[in-house]
């Protein structure tokens, strides 16, 4: 059985793509504003133009909309090491990023800090530094990875996780000495 579609449901049905329901008269579908503009006045009636105005400096809309105000342009966070990749335009927000040989560490969905890519001193690059991920290093023999830096096994304390990584080296040295005496 198909439920009967009453007048109310008909009126509340979604407007075609690129249009929105007039807030005061839900039988009217108004054309949305283009990106770079915002809604100044709703269309007066069916087939009549929506009054859209261009965003003012320092604001933008990145897609077609029926917003009453443009969105404020983002500012790159200098305290997080961010730099401006491209400035804000009426139809695109500011694009922020990091300098060369840096990567983004996201503290939360929309907040990132720039950090220098690890150089893998005393090791080799296993995976190159990416936009959102630090270099992955593999350490040379006699070194272990601590905070993505290769640290000498001489700095390995018994309580640290490095004992597992540094122990084979110690055993190898002992093994070589033992084999030399036979």
């Amino acid at each position: 059985l198909v439920p009967h579609l009453g007048d109310r449901e008909k009126r509340d049905s979604v407007c075609p793509q690129g249009k929105y329901i007039h807030p005061q008269n839900n039988s009217i579908c108004c054309t949305k504003c283009h990106k770079g503009t915002y809604l100044y006045n709703d269309c007066p009636g069916p087939g009549q133009d929506t009054d859209c105005r261009e965003c003012e400096s320092g604001s933008f809309t990145a897609s077609e909309n029926h917003l009453r105000h443009c969105l404020s342009c983002s500012k790159c966070r200098k305290e997080m090491g961010q730099v401006e990749i491209s400035s804000c335009t009426v139809d695109r927000d500011t694009v922020c990023g990091c300098r060369k040989n840096q990567y983004r560490h996201y503290w939360s969905e929309n907040l990132f800090q720039c950090f220098n890519c690890s150089l893998c001193l005393n090791g080799t690059v296993h995976l190159s530094c990416q936009e959102k991920q630090n270099t992955v290093c593999t350490c040379h023999a006699g070194f272990f990875l601590r905070e993505n830096e290769c640290v000498s096994c001489s700095n390995c304390k018994k309580s640290l996780e490095c004992t597992k990584l540094c122990l084979p080296q110690i055993e190898n040295v002992k093994g070589t000495e033992d084999s030399g005496t036979t």
Partner: nanobody, 120 residues
């Protein structure tokens, strides 16, 4: 229920040191970055420091760089802030905060705060 309980605040002379602690409960501590925020009398909130789960990434406000050190003990569900070379301008209520993974707000839960007063 998320709970963040700060301790370690008090009165200290300029140039002195304090260590703040924050005991966290009600959420999986090892899944979230944590931070410290402060509010000086009559002023707005200021981010002080943040630390990620393994402790590989830290953030410090320019005003505290080289003097404050953030750390965490994941086995104890505790966050720390070691404050050295304290100045009168460090006087504030210090809040421990859990960093949100989503949205535009960095922090989604705060503690009650602990007062730090730097005065001679």
């Amino acid at each position: 229920e998320v709970q963040l309980l700060e301790s370690g605040g008090g009165l200290v002379q300029p140039g002195g040191s304090l260590r703040l602690s924050c005991a966290a409960s009600g959420f999986t501590f090892t899944r979230y970055s944590m931070g410290w925020v402060r509010q000086a009398p009559g002023k707005g909130l200021e981010w002080v420091s943040m630390i990620d789960v393994p402790g590989n990434h830290t953030y410090y406000a320019d005003s505290v760089k080289g003097r404050f050190t953030i750390s965490r003990d994941n086995s104890k569900n505790t966050l720390y802030l070691q404050m050295n070379s304290l100045r009168a301008e460090d006087t504030a209520v210090y809040y421990c905060a859990k960093i949100s993974q989503f949205g535009s707000n960095a922090f989604d839960y705060w503690g009650q705060g602990t007062l730090v007063t730097v005065s001679s």
